[in-house]
């Protein structure tokens, strides 16, 4: 599992590809902060519940953002 | 020099199940998503979805749920596609191409695997 | 899903000729459009990606241009190797699509 509490950072490696919007339990975007200098962001599997760094920067987790986000407000009220 | 070598034709009859290997070379595999892209005769190209090559995990377009199965043997860098219960209509070229998910284009395609379906 | 409608079909020019080819999408899609070049019985080959980014050695003949839901690629200079069908990608989205395709022919 890419993840550290012992750095400042949460995530010690990052991936650029997508997962499969429909696979994911939780999607957890934080914010660049005093104690880690980038933006994070942290997606758990609904499979194991297992969680994977993903690249802000990468223009497919980039488009897996906003699918989710489309998901999202189809089906909020 | 970065290489998608794709397996031979095949000739099937309908019902009957194809599997297709997409071999890399040149980089490594699960640092880069592998896509599917149909291609009837005569035709455009037609996307069918994509893997995930470090979690094996696939993901299918609309038009190709069901029939089809896109796996990994990450041991070999070979993605493979299965297709079950051929129809005339799955006729076609397919090509395996990686996407390079920084910038998310198709960079580097296979050389295509022709897969007929006749009785 | 982004629909991409590419214009024209097919097209006939002399060498020498300019040659353009368009894509309009059903939404805007940022830029995020490549072309690629098929000759028959091969693949596909990527020749711009981001709407006008070359890629390397591919010729300057070649160019893209565009913004929002207009895209336009151009052979400034048809030359007897570029037949070939030539297709659009928009990828600004998890589920790609590329257009119907422009086939062209030498006059």
């Known amino acids: 599992v890419p993840l550290s509490r012992t750095v400042r950072c949460t995530c010690i490696s990052i991936s650029n590809q997508p997962v499969n919007p429909r696979s994911l339990e939780k999607l957890e975007i934080i914010p660049a902060s005093q104690f880690c200098p980038r933006v994070e962001i942290i997606a758990t599997m609904k499979k194991k519940g297992e969680k994977r760094c993903l690249n802000p920067e990468s223009k497919a987790i980039k488009n897996l953002l906003k699918a989710v986000s489309k998901e999202r407000s189809k089906r909020s009220p | 020099e970065v290489q998608l070598v794709q397996s031979g034709a095949e000739v099937k009859k309908p019902g009957a199940t194809v599997k297709i290997s997409c071999k890399v070379s040149?980089?490594?595999?699960?640092?880069?998503?592998m896509h599917w892209v149909r291609q009837a005769p005569g035709k455009g190209l037609k996307w069918m979805g994509w893997?995930?090559?470090?979690?094996?995990?696939?993901t299918y377009a609309d038009d190709f749920k069901g029939r089809f199965t896109f796996t990994l043997d990450t041991s070999t860098s070979t993605a493979y596609m299965e297709l079950s219960s051929l129809r005339s209509e799955d006729t076609a070229v397919y090509y395996c191409?990686?996407?390079?998910?920084?910038?998310?284009?198709?960079?580097?395609w296979g050389q295509g695997t022709t897969v007929t379906v006749s009785s | 899903d982004i629909q991409m409608t590419q214009s024209p079909s097919s097209l006939s020019a002399s060498v020498g000729d300019r040659v353009t080819i368009t894509c309009k999408a059903s939404?805007?899609?940022?830029?995020?459009i490549a072309w690629y070049q098929q000759k028959p019985g091969k693949a596909p080959k990527l020749l711009i990606h981001?709407?006008?980014t070359l890629q390397p050695g591919i010729p300057s003949r070649f160019s893209g241009s565009g913004s929002g839901r207009d895209y336009t690629f151009t052979i400034s200079s048809l030359q007897p190797e570029d037949i070939a069908t030539y297709y659009c990608?928009?990828?600004?989205?998890?589920?790609?699509?590329f257009g119907q395709g422009t086939k062209l022919e030498i006059k």
């Open positions: 040149g980089y490594t595999f699960t640092d880069y998503s």
């Open positions: 893997i995930n090559t470090e979690i094996g995990e696939p």
């Open positions: 981001y709407t006008s």
């Open positions: 191409a990686r996407n390079y998910d920084y910038d998310a284009y198709f960079d580097v």
């Open positions: 990608l928009q990828y600004d989205n998890l589920l790609f699509t």
């Open positions: 939404q805007d899609i940022n830029k995020y």
